[in-house]
């Protein structure tokens, strides 16, 4: 288990316990309960109060991080008396031993890399392990391929993201023969950590007066539909003076992605490239390969 649990309770205890795997806080059911509530307080004095489970003797915390340490609290009233109990959930282990600078990104629609750094006070023999649980907590994913630095796990590569949901809980545990290692945990939204591929199938067709650019939305890990995309087109006249402004055009995603612009013959050689982003986040992909149109003697 990754942390010590210490109970602060009056004589007649509710026997409060917390399962970090399921994020479930439970206690002994009391007869003739008239009121019960559970909540946690974190180090910044933020209070999270989830809904009670149907049996009213447990509650599940959905989106919480525990690495800074939290205090759980349960209040129960019965027709006879009131109960109150606190459960301290510290992040035991030496300060500064937990993994730090943790980050993940999804790329190529179905691959993910997570990286972290060794804690500054972690001993030489420290080893870190990554576990991922989706928001439904139905499944725990253990890192299948670790990235190592001098034998220490400092990253993880996943090539199967089927167990993820839109929001996921990441836990980096640590072990050492010398001292206790603190854990690090984080909640990440897949939509915020995905790096899109550039748009595909970019084509340019011109007639005497206009050019029409068409493209396909990139394949993404998240299920996004066409209105969820924003595109930027860089239409660039070749052989222009250095420092000449590129024409950047913003286009909203649509069922048919196209941009029609006036360009009369004879036209100079141009290139066009496109990048994509989630319309809500504008985390731009890299640019697509430049497509050339027009002629050198235009």
């Amino acid at each position: 288990e990754k942390s010590d649990l210490r109970t602060v309770a009056p004589a007649s205890s509710l026997n409060v316990r917390f399962d970090s795997r399921t994020m479930n806080l439970s206690w002994d059911c009391q007869e003739n309960t008239t009121f019960s509530k559970c909540f946690l307080t974190d180090k910044k004095n933020r209070v999270v109060e989830p809904r009670l489970s149907n049996n009213e003797c447990s509650c599940t915390f959905r989106e919480i991080c525990l690495h800074e340490g939290v205090t759980f609290e349960v209040h129960v009233n019965t027709s006879q008396r009131g109960f109150q109990q606190k459960l301290l959930y510290p992040n035991s282990g030496r300060e500064g031993t937990a993994a730090q600078n943790f980050s993940c990104f999804i790329y190529n629609a179905d691959l993910m890399n997570c990286t972290w750094a060794r804690g500054p006070t972690a001993p030489r023999d420290v080893q870190y392990f990554l576990y991922i649980r989706n928001s439904k907590r139905r499944r725990e994913i253990r890192c299948p391929y670790y990235i190592q630095d001098s034998g220490t796990h400092v990253g993880c590569h996943l090539d199967n993201l089927s167990g993820l949901t839109s929001r996921n809980y990441f836990l980096v545990n640590g072990t050492s023969r010398e001292i206790g290692i603190q854990f690090f945990d984080s909640l990440l939204d897949t939509k915020k950590i995905e790096r899109f591929n550039p748009p595909s199938n970019v084509t340019v067709r011109c007639n005497t007066t206009h050019c029409l650019v068409r493209w396909k939305q990139p394949r993404t890990y998240q299920k996004l539909s066409y209105l969820d995309f924003q595109y930027q087109l860089d239409v660039h006249r070749k052989n222009t003076q250095p420092g000449t402004e590129n024409l950047l055009i913003n286009v909203s995603g649509d069922l048919e992605n196209r941009y029609n612009f006036p360009s009369s013959e004879p036209r100079a050689k141009h290139s066009v490239k496109i990048r994509a982003a989630d319309v809500r986040i504008l985390n731009w992909s890299s640019w697509s390969e430049a497509i050339e149109f027009g002629s050198d003697d235009g």
Epitope: K223, S225, L227, D228, L255, R280
Partner: antibody
Framework: QVQLVQSGAEVKKPGASVKVSCKIS????????IHWVRQTPTKGFEWMGG????????VYAQRFQGRVTMTEDTSIDTAYLTLSSLRSDDTAVYYC?????????????WGKGTMVTVSS | QAVLTQPSSVSGAPGQRVTISCTGS?????????VSWYQQLPGTAPKLLIY???KRPSGVPDRFSASKSGTSASLAITGLQADDEADYYC???????????FGGGTKVTVL
């Protein structure tokens, strides 16, 4: 020009089933996500179901669970809604629509609607 | 009973600005889930006017704008025109119902 062309009006008896079709033209159904919504004068718009990206499958509104089935034949770019054990309060206009964004979801393009009347 | 509450009707003279409110709760608009707005002209299918709370699909004039704050959202129509006379519906996802829900609709009358 993308269009959603729905099948014609239906009159059904209570207890019967109805199957409404929605033919996509101008685009491939395999690249689209279809939801179904119905409209009645008393209840207004009711979402019936559609593709849920989180579950990666078609999900149905609780109140239609067990009575509704949504299927697709991508070879002919047609989506279908089947509603069984019809009751008089199922009399409504049934619409298919494309999901422009899963956030909401935003139902972007709509068919013209299919009037289903349930009457003995 | 619609979970998203809209006024049953609003009216305005041509050229005026009208707004339609859509009041929800902490399990839908305030959750926060995105709001969409639809226009339904008499005898026709709905048309998407707004998605992602304030974005317009191509072809929707910029006379239509929307915003969201807390547990409510609003749609504004500026420079009201005769062909804006229609029913307008808001829609969002609701985590208690686990499904998208629509408002009861607002009839806009151009005087």
């Amino acid at each position: 020009q993308v269009q959603l062309v729905q099948s014609g009006a239906e009159v059904k008896k209570p207890g019967a089933s109805v199957k409404v079709s929605c033919k996509i033209s101008g685009h491939s159904l395999s690249e689209l996500f279809i939801h179904w919504v119905r409209q009645t004068p008393t209840k207004g718009f009711e979402w019936m179901g559609g593709f849920d990206p989180e579950e990666n499958e078609i999900v149905y509104a609780q109140r239609f669970q067990g009575r509704v089935t949504m299927t697709e034949d991508t070879s002919i770019d047609t989506a279908y809604l089947t509603l069984s054990s019809l009751r008089s309060d199922d009399t409504a206009v049934y619409y298919c629509s494309t999901v422009g964004s899963f956030s909401g979801p935003a139902l972007h393009l709509w068919g013209k609607g299919t009037m289903v009347t349930v009457s003995s | 009973q619609a979970v998203l509450t809209q006024p049953s009707s609003v009216s305005g003279a041509p050229g005026q600005r009208v707004t339609i409110s859509c009041t929800g709760s902490g399990s839908n608009i305030g959750a926060p889930y995105d709001v969409s707005w639809y226009q339904q002209l008499p005898g026709t299918a709905p048309k998407l006017l707004i998605y992602h709370n304030n974005k317009r699909p191509s072809g929707v004039p910029d006379r239509f704008s929307a915003s969201k704050s807390g547990t409510s959202a609003s749609l504004a129509i500026t420079g009201l025109q005769a062909d804006d006379e229609a029913d307008y519906y808001c829609q969002s996802y609701d985590s208690q119902w686990n499904q998208p829900l629509f408002g009861g609709g607002t009839k806009v009358t151009v005087l």
